[in-house]
């Protein structure tokens, strides 16, 4: 079965800079999975942001600003990366990755 690890416990960025969050997949080849990214703010319902499927298709939540998030997959390191552009106050949250095994 697949296992996920987010090696960065926290990430501190200057406003307007770029943040990159990693999710390392083990126990299964990343190319045979879909990786989903979510965020959670205190007292709020967890929110789906973006996903990348086993075939590389990217799906974004409709209410998410265009150009804010990018998701990628690096098979060589079995890693999915969530890139947050122009970090601003409303991006402050806890980010989770999740796995769907095909």
């Amino acid at each position: 079965a697949g296992h996920l690890e987010q090696p960065q416990i926290s990430s501190t960025k200057t406003l307007s800079k770029t943040a990159r969050l990693e999710c390392v997949v083990s126990g299964i080849t990343i190319s045979a999975t879909s990786v989903y990214w979510y965020r959670e703010r205190p007292g709020e319902v967890i929110q789906f942001l973006v996903s990348i499927s086993y075939d590389g298709t990217v799906r974004k939540e409709s209410g998410i600003p265009s150009g804010k998030f990018e998701v990628d997959r690096i098979p060589e390191t079995s890693t999915s990366t969530l890139t947050i552009h122009n970090v601003e106050k409303q991006d402050i949250a806890t980010y989770y990755c999740a796995l769907w095994e095909v």
Epitope: S16, P42, G43, N86, E88
Partner: antibody
Framework: EVQLLESGGGLVKPGGSLRLSCAAS????????MNWVRQAPRKGLEWVSS????????YYADSLKGRFTISRDNAKNSLFLQMNSLRAEDTAVYYC?????????????????WGQGTMVTVSS | DIVMTQSPSSLSASVGDRVTITCRAS??????LAWYQQKPGNVPKLLIY???TLQSGVPSRFSGSGSGTDFSLTISSLQPEDFTTYYC?????????FGPGTKVDIK
Amino acid sequence: EVQLLESGGGLVKPGGSLRLSCAASGFSFSNYDMNWVRQAPRKGLEWVSSISSSSHYIYYADSLKGRFTISRDNAKNSLFLQMNSLRAEDTAVYYCARDRGVTTDYYYYALDVWGQGTMVTVSS
Amino acid sequence: DIVMTQSPSSLSASVGDRVTITCRASQGIYNYLAWYQQKPGNVPKLLIYAASTLQSGVPSRFSGSGSGTDFSLTISSLQPEDFTTYYCQKYNRAPFTFGPGTKVDIK
């Protein structure tokens, strides 16, 4: 001194347009979310719109969607509100207000600096 | 959308009185609530954010409490300059609605 100065208000006929501006000084404008709040004569406060520091997150009061557009120019320390298809019920003082910014309790929003407001009157 | 209500809409009190204004959200908003004071002819002034955190420079006679749907603003000992209007505002998610206001006047 931290300051917000609104301009662009005035008398306009129903169906007309106005563009409000807010000039910011005394703080790093590009680091703060900004808001427009209005207050009709002898009425309470009504939140109109907000825009995040890099303009990715933009929100409007439901009743105003499609008629009002918020924008900002961080290079010029300026906030704008384009108001179209104006109605009599849009008559109000329009305030520009700053969110309190990123601090140790960064999740929490609140409007800590307000401009003096600009009066918008919609009447035939 | 979440509706914000305040009670009472107005109240009469005397200098030195302890007064409490309540603000209710139609759905839970955690502690994403701010309180403002607005004197006639003046711009609103932030008093409290995060339901209970006093804004810098605000006198300690003001305090806030509550979480979820029910919140309150208490003035422990009314001063002459406190007789004015108070608004709550929620900001868990847009729209960042204000309550209708509570006017505190002299008995």
